[in-house]
Interface confidence: medium
């Protein structure tokens, strides 16, 4: 025997109080699939959360974060404060990156500068709080008598032979 509730579409619930008739979801609730025996309460985007998509009878509301905050977690379950580049968020708020570390985003933690010497390279551009160091060629490449670094040949479009 087919379950009569299977005929109830999304946006309704199968109402046991009324002979398993399909009742519309009450306001502020939704059912995203058919055959449900209750509707689900719509998510409310309050406080630091903003409504990105309104709740409908068939789909939940979606939230994002007010300016100055960014989403964390599945479905933007949390809003975390933005910091400036060159800072990281701590329990005491936004703090500048310590010397030797950087953060080039408004979120996340300060990360150590790349250690160029581990790859046998020299520092071409010093790091800052906002930017990682830029590693240059290895000292051996710069020693007298070393062959000069030739720039790569420009790429050709396929099917074009050199003139």
């Amino acid at each position: 025997l087919q379950d009569p509730c299977s005929n109830c579409p999304a946006g309704t619930f199968c109402d046991n109080n009324r002979n398993q008739i399909c009742s519309p979801c009450p306001p502020n609730s939704f059912s995203s699939a058919g055959g449900q025996r209750t509707c689900d309460i719509c998510r409310q985007c309050k406080g630091v959360f903003r409504t990105r998509k309104e709740c409908s009878s068939t789909s939940n509301a979606e939230c994002d974060c007010t300016p100055g905050f960014h989403c964390l977690g599945a479905g933007c379950s949390m809003c975390e404060q933005d910091c400036k580049q060159g800072q990281e968020l701590t329990k005491k708020g936004c703090k500048d990156c310590c010397f030797g570390t950087f953060n080039d985003q408004k979120r996340g933690i300060c990360r150590p500068w790349t250690n160029c010497s581990l790859d046998g390279k020299s520092v071409l551009v010093n790091g800052t709080k906002e930017r990682d160091v830029v590693c240059g060629p290895s000292p051996a490449d710069l020693s007298p008598g070393a062959s000069s670094v030739t720039p790569p040949a420009p790429a050709r479009e396929p099917g074009h032979s050199p003139q």
């Epitope: 109402d15 009742s23 979801c25 009450p26």
Partner: nanobody, 122 residues
């Protein structure tokens, strides 16, 4: 026992007005979420309007916004639906219903009245 009893339906011309009443017993309308649901001939149920939470936030379906007004009289423990600028497509049986929230997070209507028929016709 929780009961709802609607009244006020009838025949009205297009553009006319009606006020539906829903007398509640066994619970207090000011402390519950209650609303109106309708069923047009041969159609499914459609929620029309509701008063949610003790603050009295009101909700309306797009099809009735600006024409219908939901209200309640706490002293009389009665819910009302003032309907104006009525159209032929508003013809339906109107039910009042109590909205309940289940422990698992689900939402349903748990108590219905017997309904009152509104016919909009010239």
């Amino acid at each position: 026992e929780v009961q709802l009893l609607e009244s006020g339906g009838g025949l009205v011309q297009p553009g006319g007005s009606l006020r539906l009443s829903c007398a509640a017993s066994g619970f207090t309308v000011s402390a519950e979420d209650v609303g109106w649901v309708r069923q047009a001939p041969g159609k499914g149920l459609e929620w029309v309007s509701a008063i949610l939470d003790k603050g009295g936030s009101t909700y309306y379906a797009e099809s009735v916004k600006g024409r219908f007004t939901i209200s309640r009289d706490n002293a009389k423990n009665t819910l009302y639906l003032q309907m104006s600028s009525l159209r032929a497509e508003d013809t339906a049986v109107y039910y009042c219903a109590r909205i309940v929230y289940h422990a698992g997070g689900g939402v349903t209507f748990d108590t219905w009245g017997q309904g009152t028929l509104v016919t909009v016709s010239s």
